[in-house]
C-alpha cells in the first residue's frame, strides 16, 4: 500500500476579519493509526491549533467527524477570525506510539491571510487656533488594516489637497498595519465654513471609502476690523460714536471704550449678527455730552478678540465748536447702557 | 457500571410518530458517540442511526433516512431518536448502544454496551 | 450486509472459530451475543480485538486482511448463542451480519 500523504489543497486563503477560515486538509490513506494535529508555523516554536485527540479548542471546528472510522477529511474552521490570526497552517499526521505519538507526515502548509477593514479615519488639527494666510497642519490615522495596500487623500471643501506626507506602519511584515498622514493647508479669512476631509480607500470597503473631517472653525481665528464713526448730532451737546467691530471669529471678544486714555466701559460681545461666511460682526456705541469738555477727546475702541492681544482704533472729537453753558459740568442723565456721558 | 435505559416504546400507530429516550450513566457521557439499533420479531439486528460524541454528526440506516432524528442532550446524558412516519416494519425492539472510545455514529464494530431495549409495536 | 456462516458447533473444551468478511476497507469488526432472541446482546469484542471487563479472556478477536475472527477457546455450554459480527461500510452506514448460531454439542 501507497505511504500515507498529507494533503493541503489550497496554498492561500483569503478571509475577512470576523468571519470563518476553512482550511481544507486530507490524507491518502488510513494506515497508519493515529491522530491529526494542526500548526500555526514550523519550527520548535509552532502553535498548537487543534489536537484530535485532547484540549479545548473553541474557535475550531472539524469540518467532518473525526472520530468517524475511515475518515480521511481532517479539514478545519477557525472562528472570528482577526488579523492576528495570520500565518501558514500545517495539517500534521502523528503515528499512534507509546507513550507519545510520533510525528508521522505534515502537510504542505496553508497561508492565511486576513483581510482586516481600517478604522474610521480620525482627523485632528493644531492645537491653537491661526489666523487667515497661516499654514496649519492636520493629521489623519487609521489603524488596524491588512493588507497592507492603501490609499489616503485629503480634500478641502471637495478640491484634493496636495501637500500631505504619509507614512504607513510598520515597513515589514505584519498582521495589520496603521497609516498616519500630515497635510499642510493655508487658512482665508473664508474658511470658517470650509471642512477638511481625510479619505481612506481599501480594498475591504469595495469602493466605498472612510472618511475623517474637520471644522476649519476649530481652527480658524478671523481678528475684526475696527471702524469708529461719529454721528450726527442726536441731540443738543450729545454725540453718538459708534465702534464698528466685523468680520471676527470665533465669537469671544472682550470691547473697552477709552476716553483720553481712561478706561470708559467694557462689555462683552452678546447679540452679535452672523455673515454669510460665518463671520461676525457687531456695534458698540457711546453717546457723549460735549459740553461738559474745554478741550478736545480723544475716544478709543479697544478690542480682545479671542485672548489676543488688544487691538484699537481711536476717534478725536473736536468740542471747540460747542460752547459750553453754565451748569454743564453737572451730572447729565444717562440715557441707557450703551451711553456715556463725559463730565 | 455502565447502564444505558430506554424509555418510549409501546404501540403505536401507522404513519404517527414515536420518540424513544435513552440515558445513560456510569461514563463520561459527552465523550462516547452513540446509536440505535433494532431487532424486528425473528429477524436479525439492524442499525438504525447514530450521533458522534459532540452531537454535530448524524448518521441513519436506508430504512429510517429522511424519517428519523436523532439528537443528543450531553448535559442530561441522554439520547433521543425521533421516528416520523411510522410503518408496520418498524415494529421491534430498540436498543440503545455505546461506543467504547472509538469509531462514532455507525462505527458499529466500536459498540461495547447495550440497553435492556424497548418494544415499539406499530398496528392499526 | 457482512458475511459470517450461519451456524458452527463444537464440543465443549474445544476452540471455535466464527469469520466476518464484507466491512469497509480498513474497517474493524464487533462480535456481538445474543442468548435468546428478544434478550439484549452483549459485546464480547469491539474495535477488533478488545474485550470489554467483564467478558472472560476465553474471547477475542483479529482481523486479518479484510476478514475478522471471533476465537472462542475452551467452549462452554453457555457460550452457545446466536454471533453478530458488526462494522461500517465505505459510506459509513453500519452493517451487522445475518449472524451466526453456535451450538454446544
Known amino acids: 500500500e501507497e505511504e500515507l500523504q498529507v494533503i493541503q489543497p489550497d496554498k492561500s486563503v483569503l478571509v475577512a476579519a470576523g468571519e470563518t477560515a476553512t482550511l481544507r486538509c486530507t490524507a491518502t490513506s488510513l494506515i497508519p493509526v493515529g491522530p491529526i494535529q494542526w500548526f500555526r508555523g514550523a519550527g520548535p516554536g509552532r502553535e498548537l491549533i487543534y489536537n484530535q485527540k485532547e484540549g479545548h479548542f473553541p474557535r475550531v471546528t472539524t469540518v467532518s467527524d473525526l472520530t468517524k472510522r475511515n475518515n480521511m477529511d481532517f479539514s478545519i474552521r477557525i472562528g472570528n477570525i482577526t488579523p492576528a490570526d495570520a500565518g501558514t497552517y500545517y495539517c500534521v499526521k502523528f503515528r499512534k506510539g507509546s507513550p507519545d505519538d510520533v510525528e508521522f507526515k505534515s502537510g504542505a502548509g496553508t497561508e492565511l491571510s486576513v483581510r482586516a477593514k481600517p478604522s474610521a479615519p480620525v482627523v485632528s488639527g493644531p492645537a491653537a487656533r491661526a489666523t487667515p494666510q497661516h499654514t496649519v497642519s492636520f493629521t489623519c490615522e487609521s489603524h488596524g488594516f491588512s493588507p497592507r495596500d492603501i490609499t489616503l487623500k485629503w480634500f478641502k471643501n471637495g478640491n484634493e489637497l496636495s501637500d500631505f506626507q504619509t507614512n504607513v506602519d510598520p515597513v515589514g511584515e505584519s498582521v495589520s498595519y496603521s497609516i498616519h498622514s500630515t497635510a499642510k493647508v493655508v487658512l482665508t479669512r473664508e474658511d470658517v465654513h470650509s471642512q477638511v476631509i481625510c479619505e481612506v480607500a481599501h480594498v475591504t470597503l469595495q469602493g466605498d471609502p472612510l472618511r475623517g473631517t474637520a471644522n476649519l472653525s476649530e481652527t480658524i481665528r478671523v481678528p475684526p476690523t475696527l471702524e469708529v464713526t461719529q454721528q450726527p448730532v442726536r441731540a443738543e451737546n450729545q454725540v453718538n460714536v459708534t465702534c464698528q467691530v466685523r468680520k471676527f471669529y470665533p465669537q469671544r471678544l472682550q470691547l473697552t471704550w477709552l476716553e483720553n486714555g481712561n478706561v470708559s466701559r467694557t462689555e462683552t460681545a452678546s447679540t452679535v449678527t452672523e455673515n454669510k461666511d460665518g463671520t461676525y460682526n457687531w456695534m458698540s456705541w457711546l453717546l457723549v455730552n460735549v459740553s461738559a469738555h474745554r478741550d478736545d477727546v480723544k475716544l478709543t475702541c479697544q478690542v480682545e478678540h479671542d485672548g489676543q492681544p488688544a487691538v484699537s482704533k481711536s476717534h478725536d472729537l473736536k468740542v471747540s465748536a460747542h460752547p459750553k453753558e453754565q451748569g454743564s459740568n453737572t451730572a447729565a442723565e444717562n440715557t441707557g447702557s450703551n451711553e456715556r456721558n463725559i463730565y | 457500571a455502565v447502564t444505558l435505559d430506554e424509555s418510549g416504546g409501546g404501540l403505536q400507530t401507522p404513519g404517527g410518530a414515536l420518540s424513544l429516550v435513552c440515558k445513560g450513566s456510569?461514563?463520561?457521557?459527552?465523550?462516547?458517540?452513540m446509536n440505535w439499533v433494532r431487532q424486528a420479531p425473528g429477524k436479525g439486528l439492524e442499525w438504525v442511526a447514530g450521533i458522534s460524541s459532540d452531537g454535530r454528526f448524524t448518521y441513519y440506516g436506508a430504512a429510517v433516512q429522511g424519517r428519523a432524528t436523532i439528537s443528543r442532550d450531553n448535559g442530561q446524558s441522554t439520547v433521543r431518536l425521533q421516528l416520523n412516519n411510522l410503518r408496520a416494519e418498524d415494529t421491534a425492539t430498540y436498543y440503545c448502544?455505546?461506543?467504547?472510545?472509538?469509531?462514532?455514529?455507525?462505527?458499529?464494530?466500536?459498540?461495547?454496551?447495550w440497553g435492556h431495549g424497548t418494544e415499539v409495536i406499530v398496528s392499526s | 450486509a457482512l458475511t459470517q456462516p450461519a451456524s458452527v458447533s463444537a464440543n465443549p473444551g474445544e476452540t471455535v472459530e466464527i469469520t466476518c468478511s464484507g466491512g469497509?476497507?480498513?474497517?474493524?469488526y464487533g462480535w456481538f451475543q445474543q442468548k435468546s432472541p428478544g434478550s439484549a446482546p452483549l459485546t464480547v469484542i469491539?474495535?477488533?480485538?478488545k474485550r470489554p471487563s467483564d467478558i472472560p479472556s476465553r474471547f477475542s478477536g483479529s482481523k486479518s486482511d479484510s476478514t475478522g475472527t471471533l476465537t472462542i477457546t475452551r467452549v462452554q455450554a453457555e457460550d452457545e448463542a446466536v454471533y453478530y459480527c458488526g462494522s461500517a461500510d465505505n459510506s459509513g452506514a453500519g452493517v451487522f451480519g445475518a449472524g451466526t448460531t453456535l451450538t454446544v454439542l
Open positions: 448502544t455505546k461506543n467504547g472510545g472509538c469509531g462514532s455514529g455507525g462505527d458499529l464494530d466500536c459498540i461495547d454496551a
Open positions: 469491539y474495535d477488533n480485538g
Open positions: 469497509g476497507s480498513n474497517n474493524a
Open positions: 456510569g461514563f463520561t457521557f459527552s465523550s462516547h458517540a
